[in-house]
């Protein structure tokens, strides 16, 4: 697109509410949007006493909060639902919480996939 940003075409997809909403639980999402809009990946999760509960992952539409972010980093101190977004294919596979106010960085890695 000629603007120097990482182009996002595919993101990791996840929906914890997949049964109720009758969607796939996980997979890949191909991002589609208007030509003049940038596309990003996002991840959202809860942290209950150190236990990470994934909520949603997927494509996210043009949002300056996501511009030029190669990694998915949530910066809110202690939200009910953490949110991060990034640019680049599958950049939402790993996600991190790094509060702006300082504090420990916590990175969440996807579990290793079983060999096929």
């Amino acid at each position: 697109s000629g603007r120097g940003e990482a182009e996002t075409r595919e993101c990791i997809y996840y929906n914890a509410n997949w049964e109720l909403e009758r969607t796939n639980q996980s997979g890949l999402e191909r991002c589609e949007g208007e030509q003049d809009k940038r596309l990003h990946c996002y991840a959202s999760w809860r942290n209950s006493s150190g236990t990470i509960e994934l909520v949603k992952k997927g494509c996210w539409l043009d949002d300056f909060n996501c511009y030029d972010r190669q990694e998915c980093v949530a910066t809110e101190e202690n939200p009910q639902v953490y949110f991060c977004c990034c640019e680049g294919n599958f950049c939402n596979e790993r996600f991190t919480h790094l509060p702006e106010a300082g504090g420990p960085e916590v990175t969440y890695e996807p579990p290793p996939t079983a060999p096929t």
Epitope: N17, E32, L39, P79, Q80, V81
Partner: antibody
Framework: EVQLLESGGGLVQPGGSLRLSCAAS????????MSWVRQAPGKGLEWVSA????????YYADSVKGRFTISRDNSKNTLYLQMNSLRAEDTAVYYC?????????????WGQGTLVTVSS | DIQMTQSPSSLSASVGDRVTITCRAS??????LNWYQQKPGKAPKLLIY???TLQSGVPSRFSGSGSGTDFTLTISSLQPEDFATYYC?????????FGGGTKVEIK
Amino acid sequence: EVQLLESGGGLVQPGGSLRLSCAASGFTFSSQGMSWVRQAPGKGLEWVSAISGSGGSRYYADSVKGRFTISRDNSKNTLYLQMNSLRAEDTAVYYCAREQGPGPYAFDIWGQGTLVTVSS
Amino acid sequence: DIQMTQSPSSLSASVGDRVTITCRASQSVSRFLNWYQQKPGKAPKLLIYGISTLQSGVPSRFSGSGSGTDFTLTISSLQPEDFATYYCQQSFSLPRTFGGGTKVEIK
């Protein structure tokens, strides 16, 4: 031009049926989730029903579940809402709306609305 | 279901005023929060999606802020064409739900 155009509204008696249509143009209809949203006279907006791009997933508000059926014909770029067992409280302007593909899934394109009046 | 509560339900303001409308969700909707404008007899129009991103063609006097459960729509300098009803909406989960609306009237 991206456009949605509803039709099929009108006056119907309680217990009656009506089918609304929404003709889409200017975008790849089959790749977009679509919804029906209604607005009773002088009231706010109420989401009624949604359908995925393929038509494989359908969702309904509790107030219409079992009475309304959403469907789509991607070959005709048309969305439908079959309304049965209509009640006075279903009286409203019905809008079809496109739910933009990537998150956060806002309703970015709306039709002009069609009025459904349920009265004896 | 997630309940969306808007306040005030109506307000009177003059051209040039700064107007603030608030929206509260009954549980976190993360960044899945959108704002619409509706004029009498017309369909709603998307103003802001994802809390703060202006839809194409929307004037920069409109802005959105907030996080989690508490959100704000601000019109920095009210213009004659801004007198309308404004709705927030969550798209975090089904069913999609709207706030009750805020009618902005001429003082």
